[in-house]
Structures are given as structure tokens and as C-alpha cells.
Interface confidence: low
């Protein structure tokens, strides 16, 4: 069962799945100047048998330039950034995803893929949040969100995370900033397209802040 909407947005935070449940789909998106090959897969699908899980289908991109031109398409600045596919080395990773039954690892990059990945999550998927560079986490509970099926409807649990600027003066108890509502965005804004972005190891994140690769900007 696909999740009906996106994981909640937390200001100044990004989320990442450490592993993907069987049934998850990843769109085969190509960067500017490239397109999927004809008869190429529209998406990769996490599937499994009794012993292991893996991604079905392969994404392939080809230049969308006309055949009789040799002009090389120059990537835009944000597309020149090398894609980080290594998993975030962080305490928030609960288990070694390679040993997690019923889940696929992060798929390896394919040539000329888009700068962000669009996943279609399924019920039971968990994503983990961390604050972007320059913000620190105030935890009131788990910095994670789970897509749950309750009474026939899917919903994401609300992560208990607030990201506060390093320079912001700390607030007095009881004077917390208002948080997003537990139910996330209004129904009119929901979508089945879920975009997760490359998590940067914290020390690397500063370099990426100027050219944002995030589909959603967290203001």
C-alpha cells in the first residue's frame, strides 16, 4: 500500500530513509539535458524473495540532444555537484540496513541521473530527520517518521524534532515556537510523490548550502 502523502516537513531539517521497504518505487529521473532511454524503465522497484531484497529494473539516461550534433550538454551548477550515495554515518541509523529483512539498500547512482530522487513510499517505511548545517536539534522524542495505516488511511507520524539556529537565543521553558500540526500539511497539498534528497555527512553539508539540492526548501 502506497503512502498517500509526504513525510512531514520540519523547518531546517532534511529526512532520509536508511533502507527502503519492499514495494517502494524510485522514479527513473534524468538530469537536465538527458532523458530516459526509449523503452527504458519508468521506475525501479524494491522487490524480495525469501532470502533477500533488491531493486528490479535499471534506470538509464541518454542525451536529449539531437542525433547529428555532438554538442555536450553542460550541467547546471547544482548538477555539477557530485552525488553522495554513501549512507549518512550517524547515530540515528538504528540497524545495519544490509541485514534488515524485507528492505532494499539505497540504489547506486546511474549515469546522468537527476539531482534528487523521487521515491514512492509504502506503509511501514521509516524516515529519519536531521538538522541542516548551522542548526542544532532539540529532541522531545524520536527524530523519525513512520508511514502508518490506521483505519484504512495512511498517515505519517510526527517527528519530535525542532531545529534551532546556533545563534538563536534559547527560549524560556514554555515559550516554544509553534510546530507543524501533527497531521502535517492540509489534504489539498498532499501528493503521492515523495522526494528524498541526498543526505550529506554533517561536515560536508556546509558546502552544499549555497546551491540547494533540496526539492523542498525548508524556511
Amino acid at each position: 500500500e502506497l503512502c498517500d502523502d509526504d513525510p512531514p516537513e520540519i523547518p531546517h531539517a532534511t529526512f532520509k530513509a536508511m533502507a527502503y521497504k519492499e514495494g517502494t518505487m524510485l522514479n527513473c529521473e534524468c538530469k537536465r539535458g538527458f532523458r530516459r532511454i526509449k523503452s527504458g524503465s519508468l521506475y525501479m522497484l524494491c522487490t524480495g524473495n525469501s532470502s533477500h531484497s533488491s531493486w528490479d529494473n535499471q534506470c538509464q539516461c541518454t542525451s536529449s540532444a539531437t542525433r547529428n550534433t555532438t554538442k555536450q550538454v553542460t550541467p547546471q551548477p547544482e548538477e555539477q555537484k557530485e552525488r553522495k550515495t554513501t549512507e549518512m554515518q550517524s547515530p540515528m541509523q538504528p540497524v545495519d540496513q544490509a541485514s534488515l529483512p524485507g528492505h532494499c539498500r539505497e540504489p547506486p547512482p546511474w549515469e546522468n541521473e537527476a539531482t534528487e530522487r523521487i521515491y514512492h513510499f509504502v506503509v511501514g517505511q521509516m524516515v529519519y530527520y536531521q538538522c541542516v548545517q548551522g542548526y542544532r536539534a532539540l529532541h522531545r522524542g524520536p527524530a523519525e517518521s513512520v508511514c502508518k495505516m490506521t483505519h484504512g488511511k495512511t498517515r505519517w507520524t510526527q517527528p519530535q524534532l525542532i531545529c534551532t539556529g546556533e545563534m538563536e537565543t534559547s527560549q524560556f521553558p514554555g515559550e516554544e515556537k509553534p510546530q507543524a500540526s501533527p497531521e502535517g500539511r492540509p489534504e489539498s497539498e498532499t501528493s503521492c510523490l515523495v522526494t528524498t534528497t541526498d543526505f550529506q555527512i554533517q561536515t560536508e553539508m556546509a558546502a552544499t548550502m549555497e546551491t540547494s539540492i533540496f526539492t523542498t526548501e525548508y524556511q
Epitope: 534488515l100 511501514g124 490506521t150
Partner: nanobody
Framework: QVQLVESGGGLVQPGGSLRLSCAAS????????MGWFRRAPGKEREFVAV????????EYTDSVKGRFTISRDNDKNMVYLQMNSLKPEDTGVYYC????????????????????WGQGTQVTVSS
């Protein structure tokens, strides 16, 4: 998928003990929080206890705290409920259940959050 089979129920006198076992099959067992629920005659199914997938926390309904202990053995795919100082009001069918969310930190006492259920084992406390 997770399949669950309970055992260990029976007739016991007040003040006695029983140990319920829940055998789980399915390769995702170790990623699910596991709970015990019970249904007394003529009553709604009620939460008894839950243990987290990584065995680092447990929760109990108030009426069994200090008397019941939930545990699990992920190597054997087993969940247990040790019931001591049993009372007549503990009588009912006991069900083992697996949270339908792997790796969840939300140890819910709500039956709707549990996607996998056993058939139940009868516990009768009577003199």
C-alpha cells in the same frame, strides 16, 4: 509477513503463574514491536504489554504492572509473557500481536496499530 502462534495457556489457581509463548515465523520478525493483548469474556480486547523490536523498552497496562513480564528472544523468534500472582480478572484469551510498522519507536497500546495476530490461547484463573 509475520505469522504468530501462541501456547502456554491453561487453568491455574489464583496466585499461580503461567508463561505464555508466542512463536513467530517470517523473516521480518526482529524488526517489529511485539505485544500481548487479551479479551475477557464479554469484554473488548485490551492491551496487556508490549516490547520494542530492539528489546530496549517495555510497557504494561496498569493492572498487570509488577506481576507480568514481557520478553523476547530474537534468535529464536519467540516472545514470552511471564504471568505471576494471577487473579480471576486475568482470565481471558491472550493474543500475541506484531506491530505493523517495522523499527517503530512508537510502542502503541492500540490494537489497530498491530497488523499481525495469533489465534490466541485461553487463560483461566479460578479456584
Amino acid at each position: 509477513q509475520v505469522q504468530l502462534v501462541e501456547s502456554g495457556g491453561g487453568l491455574v489457581q489464583p496466585g499461580g503463574s503461567l508463561r505464555l509463548s508466542c512463536a513467530a515465523s517470517g523473516r521480518t520478525f526482529e524488526t517489529h514491536n511485539m505485544g500481548w493483548f487479551r479479551r475477557a469474556p464479554g469484554k473488548e480486547r485490551e492491551f496487556v504489554a508490549v516490547i520494542s523490536w530492539n528489546v530496549d523498552s517495555t510497557e504494561y497496562t496498569d493492572s498487570v504492572k509488577g506481576r507480568f513480564t514481557i520478553s523476547r528472544d530474537n534468535d529464536k523468534n519467540m516472545v514470552y509473557l511471564q504471568m505471576n500472582s494471577l487473579k480471576p480478572e486475568d482470565t481471558g484469551v491472550y493474543y500475541c500481536a506484531a506491530d505493523n510498522i517495522p523499527l517503530s519507536s512508537d510502542m502503541s497500546p492500540t490494537a489497530a496499530e498491530y497488523g499481525y495476530w495469533g489465534q490466541g490461547t485461553q487463560v483461566t484463573v479460578s479456584s
